[in-house]
């Protein structure tokens, strides 16, 4: 909501999760792994990489089925705490200028830092209008105090807020699982909010920094290395 059409394939780590229709976004973090939101879980997912217009075959797409879909063991469907999942692709993505991985964070998100949020979600705060072309939004990371004041009792240490307290610019339905990137690092995953782009109701995002060890451990545990003696 309140964003702009991204320059074509300018967000090469952005993926669309498809189950007969686009339902969530995600981020490519290595040639065979995608991170998304826990509440985007489905047992069968096709990951679509290299997308810009999700309704048109433009020639840069890679459609790869999920081989493994791993939701965080402490995901809470009511509070959306630990709203993160990992998808192992059935075959590695071909990395190129239009499809490439985003780095995991080396430090937690800092208030005031500019970030890029992207997705194919609803662009209206009242009503619905789902775009075909990838939308981008530049937005600042808010302080934890501002975040907690916006959602009293709802914000855990695994969440942070990004956006504008005045409203008008935000992620929305269909953006879940997608990236929040600051300084070339995946700081957030689109998670939840009360409505979209409402005053004093900024978007809430999963704090990826808290899950770097889980991500690395899960990838290691689900990668088959053949040792030749």
């Amino acid at each position: 909501v309140g964003g702009y059409i991204c320059e074509e394939n300018s967000v090469p780590y952005q993926v669309s999760l498809n189950s007969g229709y686009h339902f969530c976004g995600g981020s490519l973090i290595s040639e065979q792994w995608v991170v998304s939101a826990g509440h985007c879980y489905k047992s069968r997912i096709q990951v679509r990489l290299g997308e810009h217009n999700i309704e048109v075959l433009e020639g840069n797409e890679q459609f790869i089925n999920a081989a493994k879909i791993i939701r965080h063991p402490k995901y809470n469907s009511r509070t959306l705490d630990n709203d993160i999942l990992l998808i192992k692709l059935s075959s590695p993505a071909v990395i190129n200028s239009r499809v490439s991985a985003i780095s995991l964070p080396t430090a937690p998100p800092a208030a005031g830092t500019e970030s890029l949020i992207s997705g194919w979600g609803n662009t209206l705060s009242s009503g619905a209008d789902y775009p075909d072309e990838l939308q981008c939004l530049d937005a600042p990371v808010l302080s934890q105090a501002e975040c907690e004041a916006s959602y009293p009792g709802k914000i855990t240490n695994n969440m942070f807020c990004v956006g504008f307290l005045e409203g008008g610019k935000d992620s929305c339905q269909g953006d879940a699982g997608g990236p929040v990137v600051s300084n070339g690092e995946l700081q957030g995953i689109v998670s939840w909010g009360y409505g979209c782009a409402q005053k004093n109701r900024p978007g809430v995002y999963t704090k990826v920094y808290n899950y770097v060890d889980w991500i690395k451990d899960t990838i290691a545990a689900n990668s088959h290395h053949h040792h030749h003696h």
Partner: antibody
């Protein structure tokens, strides 16, 4: 409180197009998604599709080639057209509203249907 | 398409009995499973959403449980007004209904 009322011809000839309208009263059509469901006599329920006032639609893949849904916000109505009907399309047709706004997660998903019309019987016969 | 298999297709129980209906999905649908009650000549009525959440105004004798592929709907103490057909419905990917379970009084 929101109420739904289906209307349309009770009899349609084979190969023709079935057309139904659902009128929403007691509330605005603008916020939720709106569905069509049908039920052949003595049988189970089959979801046909859903529409939003923006025109955003999802159709049952098995019926997709024959279904068109539209919405008229000025009249607080939404409509169903089902083309090339056969006797197998004879059923009670229901319109319904879903609980779109009960969750705050930002995925695209489907929702349970909490308000239904009373249904209208459509018979396909020559 | 996700197929929903409900059992039994019909049952007969006495007033006060505990009634259990099961629903099985052809693939994992997490908790995206709802239960409806339909009385003869009437539209379905939502009872339970997201597997276990009771819809507002629905009596507490109705409950639901399960996750993944296997779900259960329970009436803790059957009442005469509970005579109806009950349907499970998944909304994980598009929407499909189970075949229904007709509940009668002995």
């Amino acid at each position: 409180q929101v109420q739904l009322q289906e209307s349309g011809p009770g009899l349609v000839k084979p190969s023709e197009t079935l057309s139904l309208t659902c009128t929403v009263s007691g509330g605005s059509i603008s916020s939720n998604y709106w569905h069509w469901i049908r039920q052949p006599a003595g049988k189970g329920l089959e979801w046909i599709g859903r529409i939003h006032t923006s025109g955003s639609t999802f159709y049952n893949p098995s019926l997709k080639s024959r279904v068109t849904m539209s919405v008229d916000t000025s009249k607080n109505q939404f409509s169903l057209k089902l083309s090339s009907v056969t006797a197998a399309d004879t059923a009670v047709y229901y319109c319904a509203r879903d609980i779109t706004n009960y969750g705050s997660g930002k995925s695209i998903r489907f929702y349970p249907m909490d308000v239904w019309g009373q249904g209208t019987t459509v018979t396909v016969s020559s | 398409d996700i197929q929903m298999t409900q059992s039994p297709s019909s049952l007969s129980a006495s007033v006060g009995d505990r009634v259990t209906i099961t629903c099985q999905a052809s693939q994992d649908i997490s908790n995206y499973l709802n239960w409806y009650q339909q009385k003869p000549g009437k539209a379905p009525k939502l009872l339970i959403y997201d597997a276990s959440n009771l819809e507002t105004g629905v009596p507490s004798r109705f409950s639901g449980s399960g996750s993944g592929t296997d779900f259960t709907f329970t009436i803790s103490s059957l009442q005469p007004e509970d005579i109806a057909t009950y349907y499970c419905q998944q909304d994980d990917t598009f929407i499909t209904f189970g075949g229904g379970t007709k509940v009668e009084i002995k």
